[in-house]
């Protein structure tokens, strides 16, 4: 049909970038390139109906459904979703194509369904059908990778039993400490399952799919390094594989390594050795201790010894169930308005936790850092000095943990006043919670020094705004003060703030703030 317009349907996926986390309005800023949805004419349908390819969206993802119309003249349009019509405002792009968009922010179950777009151009009318569903991630899993020895080869295979099939990569680093951070130039990534180069300083394997990324580090004892000041500890659950690598470098090949568990040499078949010469002609030896499926009796001190190095040990603890150990008592903090401060939680957990920080129903990303003593720490500094309740929540496959924090910001009270025909009220949010005084201004007391004590009702902390306490004081009006100016003052250790109210007839009252 010659009269039919050329139309294109596209899907734009928006990345909810972190700067918008915790902002309610945020139109997603960062977009990925549009995905063509085809938009084919639907056969055997009454009228002209185009059907876009089905769209599957992750929960909480933000998308735009967009139609580009190459037709002469103006167009008008209407979106219909679940029998409700939605506003539609076409505009024109640089190629003079009509552009119609439907933005869905933070996809939920209720936003899934059929979106119908009715377009009327000068030449013809037609309908475009989009079907939007939520991707079924209930069946998705992302499991922490584990290691296996490759049959008949000195190599490790990295396995992650996840759905959908994850991308597996080895993350290798040959320098010490901080320089082995993920984005450091010292870090090399290899997107493959098998690793032959097992002599590096730091070896991790990571698996990633739609659910995120999980990594496992190859636990290593380096006999050329001074031992940690605290005993290195490795936790595993019954049935998981155990891998410990012992590494030593010496000027020549004349040295050997051995593994012991509680003074007994490991059995044949539970270890294998590899050696190589490094660039400066020194000999590097590594000796792996491994158990394909650990039992409770594999718990104990594993000691790696050498004929040319001091021995070192690690404690392997086999648990039936994962755990999160931390103190869950709530903590209250009081800081100044410009004081630098971070909440922190120190915990020991296995398997590794997933965590969030929450304030005022908004979630913030949670970072965790391993400490030398086997503990990890998560800090939250992005409170922007907003008082209230902050919640740390952590979970792993077997355990959950929640800890509450209260942040109070020390500041001088700010007073707001309101009045009705029968009473005047003042509110303040300063901290520490303020005390109140009411004063009457009259000819006898032009400086408002005459204190009012009758009819005053103070309510401390009577309402919580995002966890922030507000204090109020109410003065019931009596004949003695009607028509006078009264002054309410809130004071705490940081200062005083007052508001003056004219007590006359109902209606708007002039308020004069004196600080």
């Amino acid at each position: 049909n010659q009269d039919l317009p050329v139309i294109k349907c596209v899907l734009i996926n928006h990345k909810n970038n972190d700067s918008s986390v915790g902002k309610s309005s945020s139109y997603p800023m960062v977009s990925e390139s549009p995905e063509d949805l085809g938009c084919a004419l639907r056969p055997q349908s009454s009228g002209t109906v185009y059907e876009a390819a089905a769209v599957e969206v992750d929960v909480s993802a933000s998308i735009t459904l967009q139609v580009l119309v190459d037709a002469p003249g103006n167009i008008s349009c209407l979106w219909v979703f679940k029998h409700s019509s939605l506003n539609c405002q076409p505009h024109f792009d640089l190629q003079n194509r009509g552009v119609v968009s439907m933005v869905i922010l933070k996809m939920t179950e209720t936003q899934a369904g059929e979106y119908l777009l009715f377009i009327q151009s000068e030449a013809t009318n037609y309908t475009i059908l989009f079907t939007v569903s939520i991707r079924n991630t209930l069946l998705y899993t992302l499991r922490r990778p584990y290691f296996r020895k490759m049959e008949n080869q000195d190599a490790l295979v990295c396995i992650s039993e996840s759905v959908p099939e994850p991308i597996v990569e080895w993350v290798l680093c040959d320098s010490q400490g901080e320089s082995c951070k993920e984005e450091s130039p010292a870090v090399v990534k290899k997107e493959e399952k098998v690793l032959h180069e097992l002599f590096g300083t730091d070896i991790r394997c990571c698996a990633r799919n739609e659910l995120g990324r999980e990594c496992t580090r190859l636990f290593t004892i380096d006999l050329n390094q001074t031992p940690q000041t605290t005993l290195p500890q490795l936790f595993l659950k019954v049935g998981e594989p155990l891998w410990i690598r012992c590494k030593a470098v010496h000027v020549n090949h004349g040295f050997g390594l051995t593994w012991e568990l509680e003074n007994k040499a490991l059995e044949e078949g539970n270890y294998f050795e590899m050696s190589t010469y490094s660039t400066n002609r020194t000999m590097i030896r590594i000796l792996f201790a491994f158990v394909s499926s650990v039992a409770r009796n594999d718990t104990g001190y594993y000691t790696c010894s050498s004929s040319k190095h001091p021995s070192q040990s690690a404690l392997v603890t086999i648990v039936e169930k994962g755990f999160i150990n931390a103190t869950n008592s709530s903590e209250d903090y009081e800081i100044d308005q410009y004081e630098e401060f971070c909440f922190s939680v120190r915990f020991k957990a296995y398997p590794q936790i997933r965590c969030t920080w929450t304030f005022s129903r908004k979630s913030f990303p949670c970072e965790q850092k391993g400490l030398d003593n086997g503990y990890s720490i998560s800090k939250f500094c992005n409170h922007k000095h907003q008082p209230g309740e902050y919640i740390f929540h952590a979970e792993n496959d077997d355990a959950q943990f929640t800890k509450m924090f209260t942040l109070n910001i020390r500041r001088k009270p700010q007073v707001l006043a309101e009045a009705s025909a029968s009473q005047a009220s003042c509110f303040s949010d300063g901290y520490p919670l303020p005390s109140w005084t009411w004063k009457k201004c009259s000819d006898k007391s032009p400086n408002c020094t005459e204190e009012i004590t009758e009819g005053v009702w103070n309510r401390k902390a009577n309402r919580k705004v995002f966890g922030q306490w507000v204090s109020s004081s109410t003065l019931n009006m009596s004949e003695a003060i009607k028509g006078f100016l009264v002054k309410c003052c809130a004071y705490n250790s940081l200062g005083t703030s007052c508001e003056t109210i004219l007590l006359n007839s109902p209606g708007p009252f002039p308020f004069i703030q004196d600080n």
């Epitope: 031992p227 003074n263 001190y301 010894s305 004929s307 021995s311 070192q312 690690a314």
Partner: nanobody
């Protein structure tokens, strides 16, 4: 849980001698896993001497011929015999055994 108890530190004149002992409790004892480290103020902890997996006493270059590590399996104790002490040997001396550290004993060598 292994407990390590060091003793024998003190103040000594240059050229003098001291013997440090380290007694282990709470674990089956094997002299092969003992080592001595030291930490001078503002410096990293460094290896001084150890007993290798084949029972040989090994000391590092800076103390060669002056320090000797030995042990007594019956007493669950390792020793560090220090002769010809120099001011640069001043440090806190720690013993290490099976992942655990002693609390340290101060050795001060005056010139």
């Amino acid at each position: 849980q292994v407990q390590l108890q060091e003793s024998g530190g003190g103040l000594v004149q240059a050229g003098g001698s001291l013997t440090l002992s380290c007694t282990a409790s709470g674990s089956t004892f094997s002299i092969n896993h003992f080592s001595w480290y030291r930490q001078a103020p503002g410096k990293q902890r460094e290896l001084v001497a150890f007993i290798s997996s084949d029972g040989v006493s090994i000391d590092v270059e800076s103390v060669k011929g002056r320090f000797t590590i030995s042990g007594d399996n019956d007493k669950n104790t390792a020793y560090l015999q220090m002769n010809g002490l120099k001011p640069e040997d001043t440090a806190v001396y720690y013993c290490y055994y099976r992942g655990f550290w002693g609390q340290g004993t101060q050795v001060t060598v005056s010139s």
